[in-house]
């Protein structure tokens, strides 16, 4: 018996996604099956379906297929997140380019090459013809879309609406023309799914006909989506395993983009005198390794043979014999001219971010005994002996009085963020001093970050209002308004305090801002009864580099059914990996007809090391950052969401574990989000709330 072809390769997969029909007239068909492959075969052949199948959802929990005559681009349909669902959409219906003669093209272009509107296939006006949808089943002669039902030479065509012109080809580009890559295509994330000889690519999540190690779950940052060409291993260009059992793999015909510039997310900062990060952007002329042995030219194969040639690594500047880092090693390196030493690191190149501060502290600065007596904002410190009463109020031990001499910056309360002092200014009772940690000091201020030692939740049950648990209540969400427009999110952590991001305050004039609470719609429509509008009375900037701000409200918020506070985590706590969390915001959604309603994206906590791998090792996370990955590709925080919270639940208690800050990209597929770790700054937040005066309600 002839083996039926596996058609799942013809579908684009969106994990943890389903389609919901808003238009009740749309039909769907369901059936119990064992695998998504079975769903795909039936969808492709339209067997037993009362419509042309364009997409299907495989329900992994119920082992069920849902076939659709529509896809995510159809009107009357919306995408929805769901753990147990995987959405598969026939690529022919979402592709806007053609392969070969375009026989399989099922896109929606309906204008000819010269710009004439196409005549509907079911119409005989102005041109009579025999290309009836009923005669060409499976050729999708729908509406007035360009098609090539007989696979003719010129590609997709149509009868035109101009009586003078019977038919004309449509100007639909070849997929190989549309697709392009930069450098050697390591960052290529396009939709080419066949090789240069026309073989269809094997899905990366399949092991037939070829077994391989490139499993999407093992390499989440390599873009192993569906069966698209990729370059995960530093080859000269993208490739894929093929569906031909006799051809294991083949290169794909993807041309180099005309404007051969790399993506912003992939461009290392170019330096010539020093190394930034791992030195992938080092473009200097050092040409010896650490011990003085000269480097071998990159374009030479003597004394060491290699494939790290300028041709193979086009954007890595492999000129002459200069030290470079083309392959993501820990720092720039080169092959050496010594036949006995193949490679060596050029570790003599200095690091760019070595600070040369005269005054510095180690650890958290509790032993700092320098003479600085000014805060970072330029205020003169006040004498310690005048402030002992205040100090006793927020520490529970006797401070070492011998260290608290004069008005010098000190750290008597073991503050994680360094030396500080009282100011004598009633508006700013205390602040940190402009002292950096000493060069090369890596003493962590919190230990065991990736081992759950301290629970984040304070052991208490979820608060209940009027007898109903407020699990769905998001009353702590704040819309920060700048000149009457929403610009950022924030979290109400106390009646008078909102936690948000430093970058959310473009102006220093606090009259330019307002905080809106109790709203669901960004414009406050329909929220009149529950909305509270409060002015901003002060901004307290977080420790240096934190990107946090505590925004003090001019009067306390009134807590009610619509406005509530959200809890803070314990200081230095770790939330377990894979904990399910959410980010909330009114920001950019990618939709043109954005309805202004508060959106939520579901993420899960990822350890810092794993997170760094997802960012291709280009990002080293520190103890002040927390990472969470999207359950739905491309969902996550974006412009307008900054300042908003990453909310997680532990022991039935919801807490703000992270704050969304700019600089980490907008919901980038396969790149987990990096947030400010609130647990790292929890003591600072408590200290501010305790020491700064707030108006009474």
């Amino acid at each position: 018996q002839r083996k039926r072809r596996n058609t799942i390769h013809e579908f684009k997969k969106s994990a943890k996604t389903t389609l919901i029909k808003i238009d009740p007239a749309l039909k769907i068909k369901t059936k119990k099956v064992n695998t998504a492959d079975q769903c795909a075969n039936r969808c492709t052949r339209n067997k037993g379906l009362p419509f042309t199948c364009k997409a299907f959802v495989f329900d992994k929990a119920r082992k069920q297929c849902l076939w659709f005559p529509f896809n995510s681009m159809s009107s009357g349909v919306k995408k929805e997140f769901g753990h147990e669902f995987d959405l598969y959409e026939n690529k022919d219906y979402i592709r806007n380019c053609i392969i070969g003669k375009g026989r399989s093209y099922k896109g929606t272009v309906s204008i000819t090459k010269s710009g004439i509107k196409c005549q509907p296939w079911s119409s005989m006006i102005p041109h009579e013809h025999s290309f009836l949808p009923s005669s060409y089943r499976g050729k999708d002669l729908q509406e007035n879309y360009c098609r090539n039902p007989r696979g003719e030479e010129g590609g997709p065509w149509c009868f035109t609406s101009n009586p003078e012109v019977r038919y004309e080809v449509c100007d639909i580009p070849q997929c190989s023309e549309v697709e392009c890559m930069t450098c050697n295509g390591e960052s290529y994330r396009g939709l080419m799914d066949h090789t240069e000889s026309g073989k269809i690519c094997q899905r990366w999540d399949h092991q037939t006909p070829h077994r391989h190690k490139f499993l999407p779950e093992r390499y989440p940052d390599k873009g192993f989506d569906d069966n698209y060409c990729r370059n995960p291993d530093g080859q000269p260009r993208p490739w894929c395993y093929t569906l031909d059992p006799h051809t294991r793999w083949e290169y794909c015909a993807i041309k180099t983009c005309a404007d051969n510039t790399m993506n912003d997310t992939d461009v290392p900062l170019e330096t010539t005198e020093c190394i930034q990060g791992q030195g992938e952007g080092y473009r200097g002329t050092v040409n010896t390794i650490w011990n003085g042995i000269p480097c071998q030219r990159w374009d030479s194969q003597y004394p060491h043979e290699h494939d790290m040639t300028p041709e193979n690594f086009k954007c890595k500047d492999l000129r002459e014999n200069y030290c470079r880092n083309p392959d993501g090693s820990e720092s720039p390196w080169c092959f050496t001219t010594d036949p006995n030493i193949r490679v060596g690191y050029c570790s003599q190149i200095p690091n760019c971010d070595m600070s040369h501060g005269q005054d510095c502290y180690r650890g958290n600065g509790k032993n700092y005994m320098g003479n600085l007596s000014q805060t970072r904002s330029g205020l003169t410190c006040s004498m310690w002996d005048k402030n002992m009463e205040d100090l006793h109020r927020h520490i529970f031990w006797e401070p070492d009085a011998s260290k608290l001499n004069e008005n010098y910056c000190r750290n008597p309360d073991d503050d994680a963020h360094g030396p500080w002092c009282y100011t004598g200014n009633p508006l700013i009772p205390w602040d940190y001093c402009p002292i950096s940690r000493c060069e090369g000091d890596t003493t962590p201020t919190i230990v065991n970050l990736d081992h759950p030692v301290i629970s984040c939740a304070k052991t208490k049950q979820l608060r209940v209002v009027n007898g109903i648990p407020t699990r769905t209540n998001i009353g702590w969400m704040v819309s920060l308004r700048y000149r009457n427009k929403h610009i950022c999110g924030g979290s109400l952590i106390k009646e008078s305090w909102v936690l948000t991001a430093r970058q959310c305050f473009p102006s220093r004039d606090l009259k330019d801002y307002e905080a809106w609470l109790g709203i669901h719609d960004v414009h406050g429509r329909g929220d009149e009864k529950c909305k509270q509008v409060l002015n901003v009375s002060q901004l307290v900037y977080g420790p240096e580099g934190s990107d946090l701000v505590l925004m003090k409200l001019a009067r306390p918020a009134v807590l009610d059914d619509f406005v509530s506070t959200i809890d803070l985590p314990n200081y230095g706590c770790t939330i377990p990996e894979k904990t399910s969390c959410s980010v909330y915001g009114w920001g950019y959604t990618g939709l043109i007809n954005y309805d202004g309603l508060l959106r939520v994206a579901h993420l899960y906590i990822m350890g810092n090391e794993k997170c760094s791998q997802h960012h291709r090792g280009k990002v080293t996370l520190n103890e002040s950052e927390i990472c969470a990955g999207a359950e739905k590709i491309g969902s996550g925080p974006c412009e307008g969401d900054y300042g908003g919270p990453l909310v997680c639940e532990q022991h039935k208690m919801r807490m703000v574990l992270g704050v969304i800050v700019p600089g980490r990209g907008c919901a980038i597929p396969n790149r987990p989000g990096i947030f400010v770790r609130v647990a790292y700054y929890a003591k600072w937040i408590h200290k501010i709330i305790l020491t700064y005066k707030v108006p009474q309600s």
């Epitope: 950022c488 970058q503 305050f505 102006s507 220093r508 330019d512």
Partner: antibody, heavy 119, light 110 residues
Framework: EVQLVESGGGLVQPGGSLRLSCAAS????????ISWVRQAPGKGLEWVGV???????DYASSAQGRFTISRDNSKNTLYLQMNSLRAEDTAVYYC?????????????WGQGTLVTVSS | DIQMTQSPSTLSASVGDRVTITCQAS??????LAWYQQKPGKAPKLLIY???KLASGVPSRFSGSGSGTEFTLTISSLQPDDFATYYC????????????FGGGTKVEIK
């Protein structure tokens, strides 16, 4: 080298449109606020508009409703789209990096590009 | 909205002179003020920020002072290279602002 390079200037008729570009190198445009400043021949500096790190924009009253600032992070480039141009928009247009993420002083300037609005 | 008024608009001085330029804000801008120097055909160059902090690479003969609404740029001993136009700029807020810069002061040779 850290620098800003403006382009796209030229002669345009009153009522016409023009798009200026400001290409950054050595730093990323999304990590600082960036502003456009213009200078009419023989006149002083006039602030035009700014795009902050968070993507929000502010404009001078003379530019409000006619000019739009945007950025393309993937190209590391800032743009100034100018519509309904008038003779009084004739000037050298500079893009300038603002220190930090919000409104502040300018610590890096481009060389400028000349826009002439004339029939 | 904040307006910046600079005076004088032109100033004639000789090499070695002590030169003072003032800038007035229509409302308090705390210390959020910057000073720039511009030579013909060139882009402006930052001299002073936050009213009194010297920008990197700027000679120490330049100094700034003031806070609130009144600010001053002083060149302690005018050098040949200092003949240029100087601008102040408020770095406080640009909400509803016509121009963030002062009108400029041209320092010319006497």
């Amino acid at each position: 080298e850290v620098q800003l390079v403006e382009s796209g200037g030229g002669l345009v008729q009153p009522g016409g449109s023009l798009r200026l570009s400001c290409a950054a190198s050595g730093f990323t445009v999304s990590s600082n606020a960036i502003s456009w400043v213009r200078q009419a021949p023989g006149k002083g500096l006039e602030w035009v508009g700014v795009i902050y790190v968070i993507g929000v924009t502010d404009y001078a009253s003379s530019a409000q409703g006619r000019f739009t600032i945007s950025r393309d992070n993937s190209k590391n480039t800032l743009y100034l789209q100018m519509n309904s141009l008038r003779a009084e928009d004739t000037a050298v247009y500079y893009c300038a990096r603002v220190y930090d993420s919000g409104w502040n002083h300018f610590n890096l300037w481009g060389q400028g590009t000349l826009v002439t609005v004339s029939s | 909205d904040i307006q910046m008024t600079q005076s004088p608009s032109t100033l004639s001085a000789s090499v070695g002179d002590r030169v003072t330029i003032t800038c007035q804000a229509s409302q308090s801008i705390s210390s959020w003020l910057a000073w720039y120097q511009q030579k013909p055909g060139k882009a402006p160059k930052l001299l002073i920020y936050e009213a009194s902090k010297l920008a990197s690479g700027v000679p120490s003969r330049f100094s700034g002072s003031g806070s609130g609404t009144e600010f001053t740029l002083t060149i302690s001993s005018l050098q040949p290279d200092d003949f240029a136009t100087y601008y102040c700029q408020q770095a406080y807020s640009v909400a509803n602002v016509d121009n963030a810069f002062g009108g400029g002061t041209k320092v010319e040779i006497k």
